[in-house]
């Protein structure tokens, strides 16, 4: 007689990452009886929702339900029907919604209300939609990558699960770049964290971690570009902005109303004698880099050491995983290899930015022009942020690992978020939770 396979005893969880530029749905799966083990949860699906981030629906909230349909239906297909009612669904909104809330709490609440109503129509165990804090975003990203790298495991493995993994239990720092904010999170070496707002204490799997984190709102790649444009147009002599961060020959018309729509450009706002201006690319890495540096105020620091804008940053320690847009941009530019030095990255960026726009369009015919046009800026911004913002050096550059996935799961805050809210990261071996569930409602 043939042995019949026993039905696998697994659980599922869904997290929607409602970012500033788009929403992604992640489905996670784990063996039910190994819930408290480290490294057992893995991603089985990612579904990118078609359209912009949810904050853009403020004037068309009636469309939110349709917007979420495809990916929620995909989740319905992927997860066995018998598991639907037990599968928790969480939606976390990040800096795009933080910015909307700064402008109008009422409008942000309206969007979240309709998002919640829409998601509650699916047969899952919907646990709510909320705007997560920058501190949470940093913390959960750090938890995700270290969980996936096996850094919380008590048993030191003799094998390496990823090329850059070291066999020690030293945690990796987390560098996350979004469209509207960027996070830096790591365990400093015997350094007191001088600003309480940047300090997190965790007890995970029986070990204490004192973690530094900060989220720089408005310093995601998209908002940083808006900031740069708003800063540079102040000194333009007419409605033409010759911009070194765009390829030679590139032209784009920008509405001044769009430029000043975001709270991120408020500090540069001024009455301009025109309603529109034209960006004309000149493709010069060095000048672009200089322009970006003007976004970082390094003249003021009330601590022993700062990143920029008076924000405390301890000395960098250990290896770092750089994910989300850090990875996507560098991957596009073919600069994620461990062997590429910082000097080489800079050289390649100089060449890339100097390439004529027509040539770039031909070379990358399959890439949407809106995204394609911004890689010069984004790559330069990443270098500026890491080197001048966070004080990485040519030597410490080799400690930055550009990570897309670890063991098939995307690096990002969503897995850490779900692990916490489902109580799957025990403080002891294996008991209570690091960040209390009460932070949720």
């Amino acid at each position: 007689t043939q042995n019949k396979a026993l039905p696998e005893n697994v659980k599922y969880g869904i997290v929607l990452d409602a970012g500033s530029s788009h929403t992604s749905l992640y489905i996670y799966k784990w063996p039910a009886e190994k819930e408290n083990d480290t490294g057992v949860v893995h991603q089985v699906e990612e579904c990118r929702v078609k359209g912009p981030g949810i904050s853009k629906f403020v004037q068309k909230v009636n469309e939110i339900g349709i917007y979420l349909t495809d990916c929620m239906e995909r989740a319905r297909e992927v997860i066995p029907r018998s598991q639907h009612q037990e599968t928790p669904v969480y939606l976390g909104a990040t800096a795009g919604m933080r910015l909307l809330r700064m402008e109008s709490e009422e409008l942000a609440d309206r969007v979240l209300d309709v998002v919640e109503r829409s998601l509650s129509n699916y047969p899952f165990d919907f646990q709510g939609a909320r705007i997560i804090t920058g501190q949470e975003e940093g913390a959960y990203g750090w938890i995700t990558i270290n969980y996936l790298l096996g850094k919380f495991s008590q048993k030191t493995r003799w094998f390496s699960i990823v090329p850059y993994e070291t066999n020690n239990q030293e945690t990796f720092g987390a560098l996350d770049l979004g469209g509207a904010s960027t996070q830096v999170t790591f365990v400093p070496q015997n350094q007191t964290i001088e600003s309480p707002d940047n300090a997190l204490q965790f007890r995970l799997y029986g070990k204490d971690y004192n973690v530094y984190t900060h989220s720089f709102l408005c310093y995601g790649k998209d908002q940083a570009l808006w900031q740069k444009l708003a800063k540079d147009i102040q000194v333009a002599s007419n409605e033409i902005l010759r911009d070194p961060c765009f390829h030679p020959g590139y032209k784009k018309v920008v509405n001044v109303s769009d430029l000043y729509k975001t709270p991120c450009t408020k500090r540069f706002e001024m009455t301009l004698p025109f309603q529109q201006f034209e960006i004309q690319g000149i493709g010069n890495y060095q000048q672009c880099h200089q322009s970006i540096l003007e976004l970082f105020n390094t003249s003021y620091c009330p601590y022993s050491q700062c990143a920029f804008n008076g924000i405390f940053l301890p000395p960098l320690q250990g290896d770092f995983g750089a994910f989300s847009a850090f990875y996507f941009v560098m991957k596009f530019l073919n600069l994620t290899s461990e062997k590429v030095s910082q000097e080489k990255v800079t050289e390649m960026m100089k060449k890339f930015c100097a390439q004529p726009w027509e040539e770039i369009k031909t070379s990358y015919a399959g890439v949407k022009e809106k995204y394609l046009s911004e890689y010069c800026f984004s790559g330069t911004y990443i270098l500026s942020l890491l080197l001048q913002g966070y004080h990485f050096t040519a030597d410490s550059w080799e400690h930055i690992h550009f990570i897309g996935k670890i063991q098939g799961s995307d690096a990002g805050w969503t897995l850490g978020y779900m692990l916490n809210l489902t109580n799957m990261i025990p403080a002891e071996q294996p008991l209570s939770t690091p960040l209390s569930h009460s932070t949720y409602v």
Epitope: V61, E106, V114, E116, F126, Q127
Partner: antibody
Framework: QVQLVQSGAEVKKPGSSVKVSCKAS????????ISWVRQAPGQGLEWMGS????????NYAQKFQGRVTITADESTSTAYMELSSLRSEDTAVYYC??????????????WGQGTMVTVSS | EIVLTQSPATLSLSPGERATLSCRAS??????LAWYQQKPGQAPRLLIY???NRATGIPARFSGSGSGTDFTLTISSLEPEDFAVYYC?????????FGGGTKVEIK
Amino acid sequence: QVQLVQSGAEVKKPGSSVKVSCKASGGTFSSYAISWVRQAPGQGLEWMGSIIPIFGTANYAQKFQGRVTITADESTSTAYMELSSLRSEDTAVYYCARESGGYRDHKLDVWGQGTMVTVSS
Amino acid sequence: EIVLTQSPATLSLSPGERATLSCRASQSVSSYLAWYQQKPGQAPRLLIYDASNRATGIPARFSGSGSGTDFTLTISSLEPEDFAVYYCQQSVFWPITFGGGTKVEIK
């Protein structure tokens, strides 16, 4: 002061549908959500679903998914609840109620007088 | 969904006595809990929202307390018109859910 006035009692046959209306007067209709709650004889309160008239966004309790449709007509300030494939256990008083909060605050501060729906062969 | 458990199911008291009604949630609902009063043949009426705030026109003898999972409705001194059924409702998670109700009857 907002008032919600519901349509009259109904007697229906099993398998048929019923559509109950709820007309708002004396206040803003569109921007507040309207919930529908039912109460079987001698039983507790059971939430069925809700709609925000201005957006047309409706959401339903899983138990009623596919059988209940909630709509709203902004021009007449009226919300409707239609329940199909009626069975005897659907015999209940059906209430409409205004949700006075918003995101994460679905308290029901104004209630209609209720509509008795009897399902009997 | 959030399950709300009310206790006791029935409370037999005399006018002038203090009534204490309990509502327990299956998971934290923060302070998003409302209390309703329902008399025979009438629609429910909102008494308390956000765990402790009295709705418009509700007498001061009604008070609510609690947060997270445990909530209490207190009627400091029962009036004859207070004998009714009381329901708690969590107003934060979908679907909206109600407790099974507590009947306050005359002893």
